[in-house]
């Protein structure tokens, strides 16, 4: 239904009352200069708010930091600035929260000129108590957490330095000079890239990538003339420069970098770039930017293995190297991603997959907008979703697109109706089946989150004037209430709610200004009274991913299975609560040649699933053939979709090809791997 | 053209069970949910529960908690009803019927076939 | 669980007449909402589903109308083969039924 039609709308009653009970004011007694908050735990109601203040003297910046603690959702804060000894924080490095609920904190000082090394503060309490500690370097990036054990942690020092700890920041060790770039792999391995000669800009294409398994105590090279290097899911990645030319390609790993594959993609110039997507255990996106400065490239979807590679969609938007695009992967919904493309006259259009990259079409118009001025035909025209590059533009798009996992199916988003992203005013739109239908949620730019798991969303106009009202929904943004949550408007500067949607507060950020001062000011609103009861199986009713038509056979098949959900009734007003956990089915479908890809050599002409031999190699298939390893050149032309888990049907099984024959020259062996110790 | 086909008349005594089945025909039985509806001698009609092919996935009226199971065997694209503790009140026209569907969702659209019925009659 | 109250629970009619059967929900269903009808000795058939929408086949002169808690079926002109038995039926909750409508040869 349209927004605001009243007919439809359950109103919950007495909400004033309601909220007025829990709405928490929070005035924070400094200078207005720059706030950063974050969430310390998960359920733990910790928040750790950071103010700083810059005056830029002549000679120096003198600054002023100061720290609030709160443990309860953000509803009171205490200043905890003494426990930093009334330090200057560098909000560059913000507060390096610990992985999960291991309640550690690092906070990286501003330390005088002619310190020896830097400053860090540490907690391993849920911020409750600090220890000073004076680093022997300077760090150059944030403290980076072992995902495996938090108490290992790495950093680079301003001198290239690779740095690391044990003991949670307790004592660094030098593990390596001359490093570019550093993260943790799995199992507390850490990759690095080095450099021999001059610096890492300098050496860019002739690093060489480390990998230690003992934190610094043995080393192994893995790789050399290296351009730069990801992680992804379960696959290491290194783009590697040519022997012949300034050229580089994209080498693979699935076992830490012991063995590496040359994955079959496109060689890209100097001025291009690969960009890893998104990946999961299963697969990876790679974007790969065209010659020349278009600002356009094509996505590849790999096979399990990272090595072979399906064209998924041509004319990618993703601005020159490390730019923007809006490549969003739709997490309430699996197989779900969302992109732009830039059409032949240079409009951009929105562009969705399902079925995690087979397949893109426009998004349906929804029901209740009208084609704008973009549109050639006032009846037939798409949805377009504002994301990064819109905002990178400065559009007067406050949010990107919104999913959240336990909100299965909802993704809220800005956008335009028409054939391509408009520069006019965007409206927010909603849908609630993982991206297949939109209804116009809110008019206008807004920002806005899910609280409890789905059960609540909450939204704020954009305004550039002060705010004083918050809008909320109780059936997925169908029907909106407003609620003043203060007399005096604040100019509005951010919304936040604790991060996995669980949560049933939201914390309205602003400032005040009057004549003379200016102040931060926070009101924390709790939603607990307005969702009364706990939600009961009655609340819930059964819904089909994927459905497009219950008369097909395989209604809701995406990667070989479907999955029905419980969900929340629209009309329930009740609490899916803090320990709510998404309820599925799965069901197993039949295999069809939907759920195979070509291997190599292979391809699917136009409209047609039959993966098909290629009639001779040549480009980057001819390359790969040539330096690609071998038992990959063996195969009967078609593997599984990674993640597919499809069974009987069509088993496309014929004879076993060796490609070897296609290629032209005789295989390289592929560079013999050192090790070392320290 | 798709049919729900119903076991036949059942007479019981009070105390025991029925088990009451209803065969699909002519499509596609996994992707819709089967509810069952119940119908004493001049009365109203009574929904009793539902089941989802995907995983067996019932749920039942307050009512019939306990008292009722709803099962589902894709493979013969047949649903079956089983009431227990059978009592006099229990004796009425059974119906299974497709729950109709145009999205996901599987109870929202109204139940657009029905199967002949199932007389039970429950008697000492 | 949701109640639904059909009225009248009787309705004499002639040939041609418009007529018109209310539903009331105890709470909102937004437009959850099903139309049947029964005649003695057969199964029940349905005639509008999602309050407003005409099942395939159903003759044009049924219509449904409403939303939230108010909902009415409408026979425009009342043929013969339409003396029967008529149902709401909610689907927003568990599914609860209307206690019936007859419309009987005045």
């Known amino acids: 239904s349209a927004p605001g039609e009243d007919e439809e709308c359950g109103r919950v009653r007495d909400f004033v009352a309601k909220l007025a009970n829990n709405t928490h004011q929070h005035v924070f007694d400094d200078l207005r200069g720059s706030v950063s908050l974050s969430w310390v735990g998960d359920s733990t109601g910790v928040i750790l708010v950071l103010t700083t203040f810059h005056v830029p003297l002549v000679i120096m910046t003198f600054g002023q930091s100061k720290l609030y603690r709160s443990e309860d959702y953000g509803k009171n804060f205490k200043d905890i600035t003494d426990l930093i000894n009334n330090t200057f924080i560098r909000t560059e490095f913000g507060m390096a929260i610990g992985p999960e609920n291991s309640g550690k904190v690092v906070l990286t000082a501003e330390v005088s000129g002619g310190s020896r090394g830097g400053r860090i503060f540490r907690s391993s309490d849920f911020a409750k108590n600090f220890v000073q500690t004076d680093l022997p370097f300077h760090p150059l990036t944030q403290m980076m957490y072992s995902p495996q054990n938090s108490d290992y942690l790495l950093a680079l020092s301003t001198e290239n330095g690779l740095w690391v700890s044990k003991n949670f920041g307790g004592k660094w060790e030098e593990i390596h000079k001359a490093v570019c770039l550093a993260k943790w792999g799995s199992d507390n391995t850490i990759f690095f890239t080095t450099y021999a000669n001059g610096s890492c800009k300098a050496d860019l294409g002739a690093l060489e990538l480390w990998r230690t398994s003992d934190l610094g105590k043995s080393f192994k090279t893995i790789g050399v003339k290296i351009y730069s290097f990801g992680l992804g899911g379960r696959f290491l990645f290194a783009s590697v420069m040519a022997d012949k030319d300034t050229t580089r390609r994209i080498h693979v790993s699935t076992d830490q970098g012991d063995t590496w594959s040359m994955a079959q993609l496109p060689s890209v110039g100097q001025e291009q770039f690969y960009s890893i997507l998104a990946a999961n255990d299963d697969m990876v996106f790679m974007h790969v930017d065209e010659p020349g400065d278009t600002g356009f490239g094509t996505i590849f979807t790999s096979d399990d293995r990272g090595i072979v590679y399906s064209k998924s969609l041509d004319r990618h938007l993703y601005t020159t190297t490390g730019g923007e695009t809006d490549f969003t992967n739709v997490t309430s919904l699996r197989g779900v991603y969302i992109t732009s493309v830039l059409s032949e006259d240079n409009s951009i259009q929105t562009m969705i997959t399902f079925d995690q990259g087979g397949r893109w079409t426009h998004l349906r118009k929804p029901e209740n907008s009208e084609c704008d001025a973009t549109a050639k035909n006032k009846n037939e025209c798409s949805l377009h979703i504002h994301a990064s590059y819109s905002i990178s533009q400065k559009l007067n798009v406050p949010m990107a697109p919104l999913s959240e996992p336990n909100a299965v199916g909802i993704v809220i988003a800005h956008g335009s109706v028409g054939d391509a992203i408009s520069v006019m005013v965007p409206d927010v739109y909603i849908s609630d089946d993982g991206g297949y239908s939109w209804t116009k949620m809110l008019e206008g730019p807004h920002y806005y989150t899910i609280l409890d798991s789905g059960g609540i969303i909450v939204a704020i106009e954009h305004s550039s004037r002060p705010i004083n009202v918050i809008k909320f929904s109780t059936d997925e943004g169908q029907c909106w209430q407003t609620y003043t949550f203060t007399r005096d408007p604040i100019y509005f500067t951010g919304l936040a709610s604790e991060p996995g949607a669980r949560s049933m507060n939201i914390s309205i950020w602003g400032f005040t200004e009057s004549f003379l001062t200016s102040q931060w000011v926070s009101y924390t609103i709790d939603f607990k009274d307005i969702l009364e009861r706990n939600c009961e199986e009655k609340d819930y009713t059964i819904w089909l991913a994927h459905s497009t038509d219950p008369e097909d056979y395989e209604d809701g098949c995406i990667l070989g299975y479907k999955e029905a959900f419980l969900r929340l009734r629209k009309s329930s007003v009740c609490q899916n609560g803090r320990d709510y956990v998404v309820t599925k089915q799965p069901s197993i479908c039949l295999c069809s040649l939907e759920d195979f890809l070509c291997d190599f050599g292979y391809y699917r002409p136009e409209n047609d699933s039959k993966c098909v031999e290629q009639p001779e190699l040549k480009g980057h298939d001819l390359e790969f053939c040539l330096y690609g390893r071998e038992e990959h050149l063996t195969t009967n032309g078609y593997r599984k979709i990674p993640g597919d888990k499809c069974q009987g049907g069509v088993n496309p099984v014929r004879e076993v090809k060796d490609l070897k024959k296609k290629c032209t020259s005789n295989f390289l062996s592929p560079e013999k791997q050192n090790s070392k110790s320290n | 053209q798709v049919q729900l086909v119903q076991s036949g008349a059942e007479v019981k005594k009070p105390g025991s069970s029925v088990k009451v089945s209803c065969k699909a025909s002519?499509?596609?039985?996994?992707?819709?949910?089967i509810s069952w509806v119940r119908q004493a001698p001049g009365q109203g009609l009574e929904w009793m529960g539902g089941i989802i092919p995907i995983g067996g996935w019932a749920n039942y009226a307050q009512k019939f908690q306990g008292r009722v199971t709803i099962t589902a065997d894709e493979s013969t694209s047949t649903a079956y009803m089983e009431l227990s503790s059978l009592r006099s009140e229990d004796t009425a026209v059974y119906y299974c019927a497709r729950q109709g569907r145009k999205t996901g969702y599987y109870y929202y659209y109204g139940m657009d076939v029905w199967g002949q019925g199932t007389t039970v009659t429950v008697s000492s | 669980d949701i109640q639904m109250t059909q009225s009248p629970s009787t309705l004499s009619a002639s040939v041609g007449d418009r007529v018109t059967i209310t539903c009331r929900a105890s709470q909102s269903i937004s437009s959850w909402l099903a139309w049947y009808q029964q005649k003695p000795g057969k199964a029940p058939k349905l005639l509008i589903y999602k309050a407003s929408s005409l099942e395939s086949g159903v003759p044009s002169r049924f219509s449904g109308s409403g939303s939230g808690t108010e909902f009415t079926l409408t026979i425009s002109s009342l043929q013969p083969d339409d003396f029967a038995t008529y149902y709401c039926?909610?689907?927003?909750?568990?599914?609860?039924f209307g206690g019936g409508t007859k419309v009987e040869i005045k």
């Open positions: 002519g499509g596609t039985f996994r992707n819709y949910a």
């Open positions: 039926q909610q689907a927003d909750g568990h599914i609860t």
